[in-house]
Interface confidence: medium
């Protein structure tokens, strides 16, 4: 048999070997594909199958627009002018080339010695699924599960049957000061089909120096608030990846989900006290902010409380 690959949506003509080029012809086409339950014999006279597959005057079989359901086996049996039976056998596979793959959510920079998500490579609309590969400085990157981690996901569109592939790359760069270039390529795995490449991204690797100072910003300034008001405490820390932030009041950890912002709505006297935040960074352990005092008073004009943050007010977090 002969293997045939056809692009989805395009016509495909399969010739019936040995068949006379014009009637009278003795021939029979039968097919076993995703459209048929078992072998289906096509009539040269035509019929309801004409829109899907029809026999041409020269005995060839025409599929006007191949689809995934046309994958399968096609056989023709013909009797030539000398009365000898000739058989043709085709194994048809279809393919669809996806759009150019893209790296989405790319990192802006990498930090040495810690896991960094480089980005997610996405390819949409392929058939068969194909594969995504990552390249570092032009060389194929082999995931080792430690310094190089790849998380893959393949989804099939329920209506079109085409595939969307996602591949998320995480790396642990060994040293800072380098500028690696990452790219991703999609391959269908078909002969004579070149891989499709993303645009490369070049990233700077920096050393994971200790996080710069941790700052606790309070709004309203001075930490003095009237009953029923709202206090916003913001733990500002410039570190990558962003650390987990926990909160402490009067020396005891507060029972909160990690968050860089602590909101105290509708404050009452029970909220008075000394607050600080603790940022836990994977490679540097916990770092505690200087404390701020919160005071609840009927008149908010007593000036900054001792130990509170004065000038800074509420900054913005990236």
């Amino acid at each position: 048999g002969q293997n045939i690959t056809a692009r989805i949506g395009e016509p495909l003509v399969l010739s019936c070997k040995g068949a006379p080029k014009k009637p009278p012809q003795q021939l029979e086409w039968k097919l076993n594909t995703g459209r048929t339950e078992a072998w289906k014999v096509l009539s040269p006279q035509g019929g309801p199958w004409d829109s899907v597959a029809r026999i041409l005057p020269n005995g060839s079989l025409l599929l006007p627009a191949t689809g995934i359901v046309d994958e399968g086996t096609f056989r023709c049996r013909a009797t030539n002018r000398r009365g000898k039976e000739v058989k043709s056998n085709y194994r048809v596979r279809v393919y669809q080339i996806p759009g150019k793959p893209e790296i989405v959510d790319p990192a802006s920079e990498l930090t040495a010695s810690v896991p960094n998500k480089v980005g997610t490579c996405v390819s949409e609309g392929s058939y068969p699924a194909g594969t995504l590969s990552w390249h570092l400085d032009g060389k194929l990157l082999i995931p080792d599960g430690k310094e190089t981690l790849v998380k893959e996901e393949t989804r099939r569109h329920p209506e079109t049957g085409l595939f969307t592939l996602r591949s998320e790359l995480t790396v642990i760069p060994t040293q800072g000061g380098t500028h690696p270039t990452f790219s991703c390529s999609f391959s269908l795995g078909l002969p004579r089909r070149r891989p499709l490449n993303t645009a490369p991204i070049q990233l700077r690797v920096r050393e994971p120096g200790p996080p710069e100072g941790i700052q606790l910003l309070v709004e309203p300034e001075g930490g003095i608030v009237a009953p029923g008001g709202t206090v916003t405490l913001t733990c500002a820390i410039s570190a990558q990846p962003p650390p987990q932030v926990h909160w402490i009041k009067d020396g005891a950890p507060l029972p909160l989900a990690p968050s860089p912002v602590l909101l105290l709505p509708e404050v009452g006297h029970e909220d008075e006290g000394t607050y600080s935040c603790v940022a836990t960074h994977p490679s540097h352990g916990p770092q505690e902010s200087p404390p701020v005092s919160i005071r609840v008073t009927e008149t908010g004009d007593e000036g900054p409380a001792e130990g509170s943050v004065g000038e800074s007010g509420l900054g913005t977090l990236a």
Epitope: A252, P258, V261
Partner: antibody, heavy 117, light 109 residues
Framework: QVQLQQSGAELVRPGTSVKVSCKAS????????IDWVNQRPGQGLEWIGV????????NYNEKFTGKATLTADKSSSTAYMQLSSLTSDDSAVYFC??????????WGQGTSVTVSS | QAVVTQESALTTSPGETVTLTCRSS?????????ANWVQEKPDHLFTGLIG???NRAPGVPARFSGSLIGDKAALTITGAQTEDEAIYFC?????????FGGGTKLTVL
């Protein structure tokens, strides 16, 4: 007034997942935490986890790590809890509760989840 | 995991003062356990009463108060009323999770 409106009762098959919702109204959704708690038939209360709708930060009871996933949609003021790989042990009434730092004040009416084949 | 223990049932009369307690298997209950008290009425109707050991939740009547008594957290109802008949749960915070007690069934006769 403050209200936490939970989604209706669910009857689900073992091995599947279920997503329970908790729609908040009457207050600023991102200013308070949302805790999730369950009550198995004839038993006490068990804390599942908490989400900070403002930041998306979560904290789980170790027992429910991998079983429960907490999310929140600020635009609709709704908190969600997804439970996966359900077994009959997961049959319970699930509650959401608003928390202001250290005080669980308002509770939802509960969502009954029954896992049965 | 810590175990939190409450009286299984208590009975009081209208107008009386009643105290429910909450004990921790890990030692004395402190303010760092942020004791919460929650009331359950029929049909899974839960209401938070007290948080942070002694902070009353909004709209909770002043007859409910929270405190630490000895090595336990306590909920005191001063002048109990018939509508206070319910199950009361306490919850204690242990550094990264809450643990609830088994509940106290309070009958007001």
């Amino acid at each position: 007034q403050v209200q936490l409106q939970q989604s209706g009762a669910e009857l689900v098959r073992p091995g599947t997942s279920v997503k329970v919702s908790c729609k908040a109204s009457g207050y600023a959704f991102t200013n308070y935490l949302i805790d999730w708690v369950n009550q198995r038939p004839g038993q006490g209360l068990e804390w599942i986890g908490v989400i900070n709708p403002g930041s998306g930060g979560t904290n789980y009871n170790e027992k429910f790590t991998g079983k429960a996933t907490l999310t929140a949609d600020k635009s609709s003021s709704t908190a969600y809890m997804q439970l996966s790989s359900l077994t009959s042990d997961d049959s319970a009434v699930y509650f959401c509760a608003r928390r202001r730092v250290d005080t669980m004040d308002y509770w939802g009416q509960g969502t009954s989840v029954t896992v049965s084949s | 995991q810590a175990v939190v223990t409450q009286e299984s049932a208590l009975t009081t009369s209208p107008g009386e003062t009643v105290t429910l307690t909450c004990r921790s298997s890990t030692g004395a209950v402190t303010t760092s356990n942020y004791a919460n008290w929650v009331q359950e009425k029929p049909d899974h109707l839960f209401t938070g009463l007290i948080g942070g050991t002694n902070n009353r939740a909004p709209g909770v009547p002043a007859r409910f108060s929270g405190s630490l008594i000895g090595d336990k957290a306590a909920l005191t109802i001063t002048g109990a009323q018939t509508e206070d008949e319910a199950i009361y749960f306490c919850a204690l915070w242990y550094s990264n999770h809450w643990v609830f007690g088994g509940g106290t069934k309070l009958t007001v006769l």
